[in-house]
């Protein structure tokens, strides 16, 4: 029951996370015009991964796509790539995890197959979340660098008379959506991996043992795992004295660190 709940929750959390990553990738507000300590303008600028927008005070909004590939900064291209990789991996992970769900019965799929699929989707979710977090963090770092560069020469006097105001950009809503979504996908992936451990059938090393009852000579053999229905816990075939002890080699380890570029 706990395994099913963990797997189900992991799936839902990952689903929300991937939806968030898709939303963040599509959003226009990755960077927004910094209004703090800035002359008040009747125009508000904001930029996304795919286009930049200008909203006038009247409400009129005009967006222009980045119709060039080669002319775009390498960092922006890298962020785009990371977000797309995150979405693709997440989508594949979702597809795999649907079939891996313990509550869904597909043919005569064994628990071992479901465990492997759960682990695969979990790893995919973890990598997807890391891609999103890395992409958003790279963009945020780029913004911070540009912000302080533009602050250094915000007002450049021209002949002491005319002033040109440089538009500074700060974190947009999409960054926060991306960070949260990436985190959720990561958490969902970890939950799937934890659920995988509970799903995985453990090989019994019992040999066939003959039990002699008085008056009868019947041999009982422990049944194989193939008898499992896929629903509930098959107590007949489980080792009773496990104690949770595992060797270090048995414990699956996953990458938990990532670099903020």
């Amino acid at each position: 029951m706990a395994v099913t709940a963990c797997q189900g929750l992991g799936f839902v959390v990952s689903l929300i996370g991937i939806a968030g990553i898709i939303a963040a990738t599509c959003m226009d507000q990755w960077s927004t015009q910094d209004l703090y300590n800035n002359p008040v303008t009747a125009v508000f600028n904001y930029q996304g991964l795919w286009r930049s927008c200008v909203r006038e005070s009247s409400g009129f909004t005009e967006c222009r796509g980045y119709f060039t590939l080669l002319g775009l900064p390498a960092m922006l291209q890298a962020v785009r790539a990371l977000m797309i990789v995150g979405i693709v991996l997440g989508a594949i992970g979702l597809l795999v995890s649907i079939f891996a769900l313990k509550c869904i019965r597909i043919g005569s799929m064994e628990d071992s197959a479901k465990a492997n699929m759960t682990l695969t989707s979990g790893i995919m979710f973890i990598v997807s979340g890391l891609c999103a977090i890395a992409g958003v963090s790279v963009f945020a770092n780029m913004l911070v660098t540009n912000f302080w560069m533009s602050t250094a020469n915000m007002y450049t006097g021209m002949g002491g008379m005319v002033q040109t105001v440089q538009t500074r950009y700060t974190f947009g809503a999409a960054l926060f959506v991306g960070w949260v979504a990436g985190g959720l996908t990561l958490i969902g992936g970890v939950m799937m991996c934890i659920a995988c451990r509970g799903l995985a059938p453990e090989e019994t090393n019992y040999k066939a043992v003959s039990y002699h009852a008085s008056g009868h000579s019947v041999a009982y053999k422990p049944g194989g795992f193939k008898a499992s229905t896929g629903f509930g816990s098959n107590t007949k075939n489980k080792k009773i004295y496990d104690g949770g002890a595992r060797t270090e080699d048995e414990v699956q380890s996953y990458p938990s660190k990532h670099d903020y570029v």
């Epitope: 930049s52 200008v54 009247s58």
Partner: antibody, heavy 118, light 113 residues
Framework: QVQLVESGGGVVQPGRSLRLSCAAS????????VHWVRQAPGKGLEWVAV???????NYNSALMSRFTISRDNSKNTLYLQMNSLRAEDTAVYYC????????????WGQGTMVTVSS | DVVMTQSPLSLPVTLGQPASISCKSS????????????LTWFQQRPGQSPRRLIY???TGESGVPDRFSGSGSGTDFTLKISRVEAEDVGVYYC?????????FGGGTKVEIK
């Protein structure tokens, strides 16, 4: 047909208050912003204030402490409350619709004359 | 506040001849986001309310004769009348539509010689 009709102007003593009205027709105040602009006799145009479709306001910093822009959406009417009036506030006051493009002013009223005199 | 400086103050022109009005702003009116200049030109005929001729520095208002054209970018702008007609007599104003408070130029009076 977009139309703006100002009213409420007249002769007022210095230090007194006056409220100007601007009745808008042909468009909604919740869709378009409206500006107040004034013109002293024989002088140029001076921007006073604006209330945008969303309700946010901006003022000429020199007049902000004395003038307040507001609107009544149900009546589709704009107001300019002018307090502590001075002789230099004598002018024709125009209300003008904020254009959807370019932040300009595309339709203007005929104006109402405000004379501040003792 | 952004200061808008218009020149000349008065412009006597011959009918059918071109006319040019200059407007300079103390800060750039060019928005980097859309590369548009937030400068508006108005015409005020004697005894009338102003009317918008040009917005975004060079986009003509619908219904405005195409003899009126706007140009310039950043801080220097120009309004040109290709062939002045009698109905063009009046005062022309440029307006900063980028920074609050919106400010107008002092005006240029166009009159027939």
């Amino acid at each position: 047909q977009v139309q703006l009709v100002e009213s409420g102007g007249g002769v007022v003593q210095p230090g007194r208050s006056l409220r100007l009205s601007c009745a808008a027709s042909g468009f909604s105040l919740t869709t378009y912003g409206v500006h107040w602009v004034r013109q002293a006799p024989g002088k140029g145009l001076e921007w006073v204030a604006v209330i945008w479709a969303g309700g946010s306001t901006n003022y000429n910093s020199a007049l902000m402490s004395r003038f307040t822009i507001s609107r009544d959406n149900s009546k589709n009417t704009l107001y300019l409350q002018m307090n502590s009036l001075r002789a230099e506030d004598t002018a024709v006051y125009y209300c003008a619709r904020a254009a959807y493009y370019g932040n300009g002013l595309d339709y203007w009223g005929q104006g109402t004359m405000v004379t501040v005199s003792s | 506040d952004v200061v808008m400086t218009q020149s000349p103050l008065s412009l006597p022109v011959t009918l059918g001849q071109p006319a040019s009005i200059s407007c300079k702003s103390s800060q750039t009116l060019l928005n980097s986001g859309n590369q548009k200049n937030y400068l508006t030109w108005f015409q005020q005929r004697p005894g009338q309310s102003p009317r918008r001729l040009i917005y975004w520095a060079s986009t003509g208002e619908s219904g405005v004769p195409d003899r009126f054209s706007g140009s310039g970018s950043g801080t220097d702008f120009t309004l040109k009348i290709s062939r002045v007609e009698a109905e063009d007599v009046g005062v022309y104003y440029c307006q900063n539509a980028y920074f609050y408070p919106f400010t107008f130029g002092g005006g240029t009076k166009v009159e027939i010689k």
